[in-house]
Amino acid sequence: VPLSRTVRCTCISISNQPVNPRSLEKLEIIPASQFCPRVEIIATMKKKGEKRCLNPESKAIKNLLKAVSKERSKRSP
């Protein structure tokens, strides 16, 4: 699992493996902060609950994040 508790960022390495959105259990978005200067995207896969750190700049992830922003705007008053 490419996660670390010893460094400030959660992700040590970014997976370049393509992610089939249908195989995603969930997506967690950790915004940039004083502890980690970059946005981190952590995918939990349905199969075995494997966690992967994904590249926020990839086209696939940008499309998934587009759907997230739509969901956020639906919930905002």
């Epitope: 393509p18 089939n20 959105p21 249908r22 195989s23 995603l24 259990e25 969930k26 997506l27 967690e28 978005i29 950790i30 349905k46 199969k47 990839s58 086209k59 696939a60 499309n63 998934l64 759907a67 997230v68 739509k70 969901e71 956020r72 919930r75």
Partner: antibody, heavy 126, light 110 residues
Framework: QLVESGGGLIQPGGSLRLSCAAS????????MNWVRQAPGKGLEWVSS???????YYADSVKGRFTISRDNSKNTLFLQINSLRAEDTAVYYC??????????????????????WGQGTLVTVSS | QSVLTQPPSASGTPGQRVSISCSGS????????VNWYQHLPGTAPKLLIY???QRPSGVPDRFSGSKSGTSASLAISGLQSEDEADYYC???????????FGGGTKVTVL
């Protein structure tokens, strides 16, 4: 709305390109699928193309079928090569609807085919 | 042989309740939501239930869906003659990396 075309009678080993013209939404922004139904059989998923251009195929068609799209024409395609008798079916294109729910900081994605075409018949026979 | 198992047929008289089962495994129904489609021969399949139990607008509330573990079911209460059709369950299979359908259930209104 989705309208398929390109079906017909073709000999075993032949090739065919099916088209699916979309209106009312953009094929580039959505996930698109091909699903088929052989005579007297049930629905069978064939292939999907996602908005990042990644493609997926059923094992039965892998290496023979190619899904693609032309964003300028707002059209989905299925190139079918090395046709076999068992490929005889009505071929439907269908749009995947994506929706997202959230709990805490986690986002969950769900998909379902909400728009279907009327289908185009491909008959493989000598 | 379909990955998801449905009974080939179901029937009832008008007004009756009919239930259709859909049995799968941990790699499909167990880890994904189930969608149900209604199909009349010669027409486009129609989405009936999504996300296990949600009805799209325009689908009568006579149709309901549920899921438990690796099985799902579709219920039609107050059966009507226009409900005569084939019904398919579907889910993503993470082992096959593809969408899988049940074999379909033909509903007949007696």
């Amino acid at each position: 709305q989705l309208v398929e075309s390109g079906g017909g009678l073709i000999q075993p080993g032949g090739s065919l390109r099916l088209s699916c013209a979309a209106s009312g939404f953009s094929v580039s922004d959505t996930y698109m699928n091909w699903v088929r139904q052989a005579p007297g059989k049930g629905l069978e998923w064939v292939s999907s193309i996602y908005s990042d251009d990644s493609t997926y195929y059923a094992d039965s068609v892998k290496g023979r079928f190619t899904i693609s799209r032309d964003n300028s024409k707002n059209t989905l395609f299925l190139q079918i090569n090395s046709l076999r008798a068992e490929d005889t079916a009505v071929y439907y294109c269908a749009r995947d609807k994506e929706y997202v729910t959230s709990t805490g900081g986690a986002y969950y994605y769900f998909y379902y085919m909400d728009v279907w075409g009327q289908g185009t018949l491909v008959t493989v026979s000598s | 042989q379909s990955v998801l198992t449905q009974p080939p047929s179901a029937s009832g008289t008008p007004g009756q309740r009919v239930s259709i089962s859909c049995s799968g495994s941990s790699s499909n129904i167990g880890s994904d939501t189930v969608n149900w489609y209604q199909h009349l021969p010669g027409t486009a399949p129609k989405l009936l239930i999504y996300n296990n139990n949600q009805r799209p607008s325009g689908v009568p509330d006579r149709f309901s869906g549920s899921k438990s573990g690796t099985s799902a079911s579709l219920a039609i209460s107050g059966l009507q003659s226009e409900d005569e059709a084939d019904y398919y369950c579907a889910a993503w299979d993470d082992s096959l990396n593809g969408l899988v359908f049940g074999g379909g259930t033909k509903v007949t209104v007696l």
